[in-house]
Interface confidence: medium
C-alpha cells in the first residue's frame, strides 16, 4: 500500500480581517493511525493551532467530523481572523506512539494572508496658530492595514496638495502596517472656512477611500486691521471716536482706549459680526468730553488679539477746534449707529 501523503491543496489563502479562514488538508490513507495537528510556522518555534487529540481551541472548528473512523479530511476553519494570524500553516500527521505520538508527515503548508482595513486617518495640525502666508505642517496617521500597498493623498478644499512626505512602516515583512504622512500647507486669508483632508486608499476599501479632516479654523490666526475715525456729535463739548476692528480670527480680542497714554477703558469683543470668509468685525466707541482737556488729546485704540502683542492706531484730537470740524474720514450722523456701544 502506498505511503500516506498529507495534501494541502492551497498554497495560499487570502482572508479579510474579521472573516473566517478555511485551511484545507486531506490524507491519502488511514494508516498509520494517529492524530492530526495544525501549526503555524515550522521548526522548534512553531505555534500549535489545533490538536485533534486534546486541548481547547475556541477559534478553530473542523470542516468534517474527525471522530469518524474513515475520515481523511482534516481541514479547519479559523474564525475572526486578524492580521496577527498571518503566516504559513502546516497540517501534520502524527503516528500513535508511547508515551508520545511521533510526527509522521507534514503537508507543504498554506500561507494565510490577511487583508486588514486601515484605521480611520487621524489628521493633526500644529500646536500653535499661524497667520496667513505662513506654511504649517499637518500629519496624517493610519494603522493596522495589510497588505502593505497603500495610497495616501492630501487635499485642501478639494484641491490636491503636492508638498507632502509619506512613510509606511515597518519596511520589512509584517502582519500589519502603519502609514504616516506630513503635508505642508500655506495659509491664506480665507482659510477660516478651509479644510485639510487626508485620503487613504487601500485594496480592502473597494474604491471607497477613508478620509480624515482638519479644520484650518483651529490653525489660523488672522490679525485685525484697525481704523480710528472721529464722528460728528451734536453736543459742543463731546467728541465721539470709533475704533473699527476688522477681519480678525479667532474672536478672542481685548481692546483698550488710551487718552494721552493713560488707560481710559478696556473691553472684550462680544457682539461681533462675521464676514463671508469667517473672520470677525467689531467696533468700539469712545465719547470724549473735550471740555475736560486743555491741550490736544492723543486717543489710541490698542488691541490685543488672541494673546499676541498689542497693535494700536492713534487719532489726534485737537481741542482748540470746533468738534464738528475734526477728521475728514467720518461717517455721517445718520448711519444709525447702535447707541448701546457708546460709552
Amino acid at each position: 500500500e502506498e505511503e500516506l501523503q498529507v495534501i494541502q491543496p492551497d498554497k495560499s489563502v487570502l482572508v479579510a480581517a474579521g472573516e473566517t479562514a478555511t485551511l484545507r488538508c486531506t490524507a491519502t490513507s488511514l494508516i498509520p493511525v494517529g492524530p492530526i495537528q495544525w501549526f503555524r510556522g515550522a521548526g522548534p518555534g512553531r505555534e500549535l493551532i489545533y490538536n485533534q487529540k486534546e486541548g481547547h481551541f475556541p477559534r478553530v472548528t473542523t470542516v468534517s467530523d474527525l471522530t469518524k473512523r474513515n475520515n481523511m479530511d482534516f481541514s479547519i476553519r479559523i474564525g475572526n481572523i486578524t492580521p496577527a494570524d498571518a503566516g504559513t500553516y502546516y497540517c501534520v500527521k502524527f503516528r500513535k506512539g508511547s508515551p508520545d505520538d511521533v510526527e509522521f508527515k507534514s503537508g507543504a503548508g498554506t500561507e494565510l494572508s490577511v487583508r486588514a482595513k486601515p484605521s480611520a486617518p487621524v489628521v493633526s495640525g500644529p500646536a500653535a496658530r499661524a497667520t496667513p502666508q505662513h506654511t504649517v505642517s499637518f500629519t496624517c496617521e493610519s494603522h493596522g492595514f495589510s497588505p502593505r500597498d497603500i495610497t495616501l493623498k492630501w487635499f485642501k478644499n478639494g484641491n490636491e496638495l503636492s508638498d507632502f512626505q509619506t512613510n509606511v512602516d515597518p519596511v520589512g515583512e509584517s502582519v500589519s502596517y502603519s502609514i504616516h504622512s506630513t503635508a505642508k500647507v500655506v495659509l491664506t486669508r480665507e482659510d477660516v472656512h478651509s479644510q485639510v483632508i487626508c485620503e487613504v486608499a487601500h485594496v480592502t476599501l473597494q474604491g471607497d477611500p477613508l478620509r480624515g479632516t482638519a479644520n484650518l479654523s483651529e490653525t489660523i490666526r488672522v490679525p485685525p486691521t484697525l481704523e480710528v475715525t472721529q464722528q460728528p456729535v451734536r453736543a459742543e463739548n463731546q467728541v465721539n471716536v470709533t475704533c473699527q476692528v476688522r477681519k480678525f480670527y479667532p474672536q478672542r480680542l481685548q481692546l483698550t482706549w488710551l487718552e494721552n497714554g493713560n488707560v481710559s477703558r478696556t473691553e472684550t469683543a462680544s457682539t461681533v459680526t462675521e464676514n463671508k470668509d469667517g473672520t470677525y468685525n467689531w467696533m468700539s466707541w469712545l465719547l470724549v468730553n473735550v471740555s475736560a482737556h486743555r491741550d490736544d488729546v492723543k486717543l489710541t485704540c490698542q488691541v490685543e488679539h488672541d494673546g499676541q502683542p498689542a497693535v494700536s492706531k492713534s487719532h489726534d484730537l485737537k481741542v482748540s477746534a470746533h468738534p464738528k470740524e475734526q477728521g475728514s474720514n467720518t461717517a455721517a450722523e445718520n448711519t444709525g449707529s447702535n447707541e448701546r456701544n457708546i460709552y
Epitope: T188, K247, E274, N275, N281, N338
Partner: antibody, heavy 131, light 103 residues
C-alpha cells in the same frame, strides 16, 4: 429692478469740494454695503470709498488716492449714499459710479467686502476738475 | 496689486479663460463695453452669477488666482473685463482690465 442714479457731477475747480449723491431703488437699501468707484479717462476702475450697513457698526473704507479727502455717508431713510471729496485735484477727473455690494448683514453675519461682491452699478456721473 | 492679462482673443464658440492673480481674497468680474460706460457684473464672490447674466459665464478660484471662464464665446462678449479684489491691507482694488477680442 435695482437702479442706482448718480448726481452732482460736472465741472469742478481744483482745491474745491465735490458732493455726489446716489439714489437707490429696487432693493432694501439698509441691508447692503455701498460704494463709489471711479474711472479716469482712458484708465481702469479705481475704488474710491465704501460704507457698510449701519446696523453692523462697521463704518467706512477709502481708496488710497482719496484717503483723508473723502467722506462717504448714507441715509437709509432716503436710500441715498453721498460722497464728499475735498481739495479736488486734476487727477480726480473721471466718471464716478455708484455700486451696490451683494454683501451686507443678516443676523450676526456681516461683510466688509465690497470690490469683489459688487452686483449692481449706476450709469455714472462725469466729474471734470479743471481751472 | 492685482494682475490680469492685458488682452485675450478667441473665435466665436471657443472657451476663453481670463485669470486674475491677487492677494488671495475673493474675486468679482466686471464687464465694460466702452470706457466710461457703466460696468456690468458678470461674476461676484468668486463664482456667483447675477440672474441676468448668461450661464456661459462662470467663475472659479484656485489658491490666490481667480478665473473667469466664458464657454462658447460670442461676438457680444467683446469688452474689457476687470477683476475686483482686496489687497493684504483689505483695501478694495481692481485689475487693470483684460480686453477680450472675438475674432
Amino acid at each position: 429692478a435695482v437702479t442706482l442714479d448718480e448726481s452732482g457731477g460736472g465741472l469742478q475747480t481744483p482745491g474745491g469740494a465735490l458732493s455726489l449723491v446716489c439714489k437707490a431703488s429696487g432693493f432694501t437699501f439698509s441691508s447692503y454695503n455701498m460704494g463709489w468707484v471711479r474711472q479716469a479717462p482712458g484708465k481702469g476702475l479705481e475704488f474710491v470709498a465704501g460704507i457698510y450697513i449701519a446696523s453692523g457698526d462697521l463704518g467706512t473704507t477709502y481708496g488710497a488716492a482719496v484717503q483723508g479727502r473723502a467722506t462717504i455717508s448714507r441715509d437709509d431713510g432716503q436710500s441715498t449714499v453721498r460722497l464728499q471729496l475735498n481739495n479736488l485735484r486734476a487727477e480726480d477727473t473721471g466718471t464716478y459710479f455708484c455700486a451696490k455690494s451683494a454683501g451686507g448683514c443678516s443676523a450676526h453675519s456681516c461683510d466688509t467686502y465690497i470690490a469683489d461682491s459688487i452686483d449692481a452699478w449706476g450709469h455714472g456721473t462725469e466729474v471734470i476738475v479743471s481751472s | 496689486a492685482v494682475t490680469q492679462p492685458a488682452s485675450v482673443s478667441a473665435n466665436p464658440g471657443e472657451t476663453v479663460k481670463i485669470t486674475c492673480s491677487g492677494d488671495s481674497s475673493y474675486y468679482g468680474w466686471y464687464q465694460q463695453k466702452s470706457p466710461g460706460s457703466a460696468p456690468v457684473t458678470v461674476i461676484y464672490d468668486d463664482n456667483k452669477r447675477p440672474s441676468n447674466i448668461p450661464s456661459r459665464f462662470s467663475g472659479s478660484k484656485s489658491g490666490s488666482t481667480g478665473t473667469l471662464t466664458i464657454t462658447g464665446v460670442q461676438a457680444d462678449d467683446e469688452a474689457v473685463y476687470f477683476c475686483g479684489n482686496e489687497d493684504n491691507s483689505y483695501v478694495a482694488i481692481f485689475g487693470a482690465g483684460t480686453t477680450l477680442t472675438v475674432l
